[in-house]
């Protein structure tokens, strides 16, 4: 990364340094330390203060984005004196060169696409690179398949999501022979970016008085159980006047997903389709294929 690290410190320096790969801020240990703390301040004056590591000469920031520029600060007291040091972490490079409109979505349970646009002031030869680190920071994933526009990487396709955790750090770096390119970073929750497939195995069975719809919950990337799903059923009578209201039914997820509704014979031709969402977010999937039941002469 082409970010400058500029230190603002009194004469006897703590030699503060920051490793953006591990998000670890460290400094020279002082003898007889009685107190130490580290924190960062972002451009909106928000302060993040992580726990100190056991050796008390470093701290690790878990959930931070750096692209707007931050200032790290370390305060150390020893039995003799106090130390204070700031470390500026700007996003160096020309303003407006970073990737923008960054977004990702998981689909089909085990695939992910991320897309971005080139920065408005980025030169023609700009090239972007995506790196993903999971919240445990044990592994860095480099984009395996880039989506290109006139030779510039403007997206990434991943078909192996095994390295991801529930929350992940995305970094888009840029390079150019002409000028420095700013980076963009983002923290994304997998639960917020997953698009579910519609429910599967939808069946309708009718007797003389009722119809029973059954379905299976969609396969998902997240580890979800039945209560995490909400379903919507669209039961639609065929050949009705345009503008007639469809019957939309909300059903909570259960171990056996079913919906039983009164429908006596002879019954007109109907169709039913179902969609699924995470009950906490209600980001609806597309509809399942319509299943028809009943008869034209009902």
């Amino acid at each position: 990364e082409k970010s400058d690290l500029r230190t603002v410190a009194p004469a006897s320096s703590l030699n503060v340094r920051f490793d953006s790969r591990t998000m670890n801020l460290s400094w020279d240990c002082q003898e007889n330390t009685t107190f130490s703390k580290c924190f960062l301040t972002d451009k909106k004056n928000r302060v993040v203060e992580p726990r100190l590591s056991n050796n008390e000469c470093s701290c690790t920031f878990r959930e931070i984005c750096l692209h707007e520029g931050v200032t790290f600060e370390v305060h150390v007291n020893t039995s003799q004196r106090g130390f204070q040091q700031k470390l500026l972490y700007p996003n160096s490079g020309r303003e407006g060169t970073a990737a923008q409109n960054f977004s990702c979505f998981i689909y089909n349970a085990d695939l992910m696409n991320c897309t971005w646009a080139r920065g408005p002031t980025a030169p023609r030869d700009v090239q972007y690179f995506l790196y993903i680190r999971n919240s445990k920071r044990r592994r860095e994933i480099r984009c395996p398949y880039y989506i290109q526009d006139s030779g510039t990487h403007v997206g990434c396709h991943l078909d192996n999501l095994s390295g991801l955790t529930s929350r992940n750090y995305f970094l888009v770096n840029g390079t150019s022979r002409e000028i420095g390119i700013q980076f963009f970073d983002s923290l994304l929750d997998t639960k917020k970016i997953e698009r579910f497939n519609p429910p599967s195995n939808v069946t309708v069975r009718c007797n003389t008085t009722h119809c029973l719809v059954r379905w299976k919950q969609p396969r998902t990337y997240q580890k979800l159980s039945y209560l995490d799903f909400q379903y919507q059923l669209d039961v639609h009578r065929k050949n009705t006047q345009p503008g007639t209201e469809n019957l939309l039914i909300n059903v909570s997820g259960d171990l056996e997903n079913r919906y039983n509704f009164p429908s006596s014979e002879p019954r007109a031709k109907h169709s039913v389709k179902i969609r699924a969402a995470d009950v906490r977010i209600l980001n609806w999937s597309s509809w399942s294929e319509a299943i028809e039941f009943g008869s034209d002469d009902g």
Partner: antibody
């Protein structure tokens, strides 16, 4: 409709072990996550452990670590809880439960409970 | 001593509204982890009433509702009925204990 059928009541001596079973009917155990919870009049409900899909393994509550073992026989859709080195304060009703949501664990279906009495 | 704190009992006349509080800490409800509520009728296993703070499973009447704010949660029962007489428990997850935690239970009496 899914059911969890637990084994019958047990009376054990201090220092002994007990094995409680939980048979699932109406659904395949291999598609479920089973946790075990016990209830005493003095301590109320205590979570003992269960299958964690994130870790892909059975995890145990710290206070039971070393004394508790949870196993599953998916061929007969049965989960087991074994608690060793029993003490009088292990006298409780032991429940198996199906996890309906993982974050945090939420228990959508419960067995009827197995009463375990530890007495000399 | 239960990790989550509930009042030991509440009571109300038929048709009235009662609420049960559940107080936790920054390592459980305030972390923030979702809260579930269970009803236990005498001599039976618990039954899930509320999950993800305010969602009702199929078959649970809308007389039962719940909310969460900060480090505490509450369950409300409106239109109290005789068969609501039971023990009610809140449950969440605690990061410092790495497991599920429960409240001590609240006995609801219908007068």
């Amino acid at each position: 409709q899914v059911q969890l059928v637990q084994s019958g009541a047990e009376v054990k001596k201090p220092g002994a072990s007990v094995k409680v079973s939980c048979k699932i009917s109406g659904h395949s155990l291999s598609e479920l996550s089973i946790h075990w919870v016990r209830q005493t009049p003095t301590k109320g409900f205590e979570w003992m452990g269960g299958f964690d899909p994130e870790e892909n393994e059975i995890v145990y509550a710290q206070r039971f670590q070393g004394r508790v073992t949870m196993t599953e026989d998916t061929s007969i859709d049965t989960a087991y809880l074994t608690l060793s080195s029993l003490r009088s304060d292990d006298t409780a009703v032991y429940y198996c439960a199906i996890v309906g949501s993982f974050s945090p664990p939420t228990y959508g279906y419960w067995g009827k409970g197995t009463m375990v009495t530890v007495s000399s | 001593q239960a990790v989550l704190t509930q009042p030991s009992s509440v009571s109300g006349a038929p048709g009235q509204r009662v609420t049960i509080s559940c107080t936790g800490s920054g390592s459980n409800i305030g972390a923030p982890y979702d809260v579930s509520w269970y009803q236990q009728l005498p001599g039976t296993a618990p039954k899930l009433l509320i999950y993800h703070n305010n969602k009702r499973p199929s078959g649970v009447p809308d007389r039962f509702s719940a909310s969460k704010s900060g480090t505490s949660a509450s369950l409300a029962i409106t239109g109290l009925q005789a068969d609501d007489e039971a023990d009610y428990y809140c449950q969440s997850y605690d990061s410092s204990l790495s497991g599920s935690v429960f409240g001590g239970g609240t006995k609801v009496t219908v007068l």
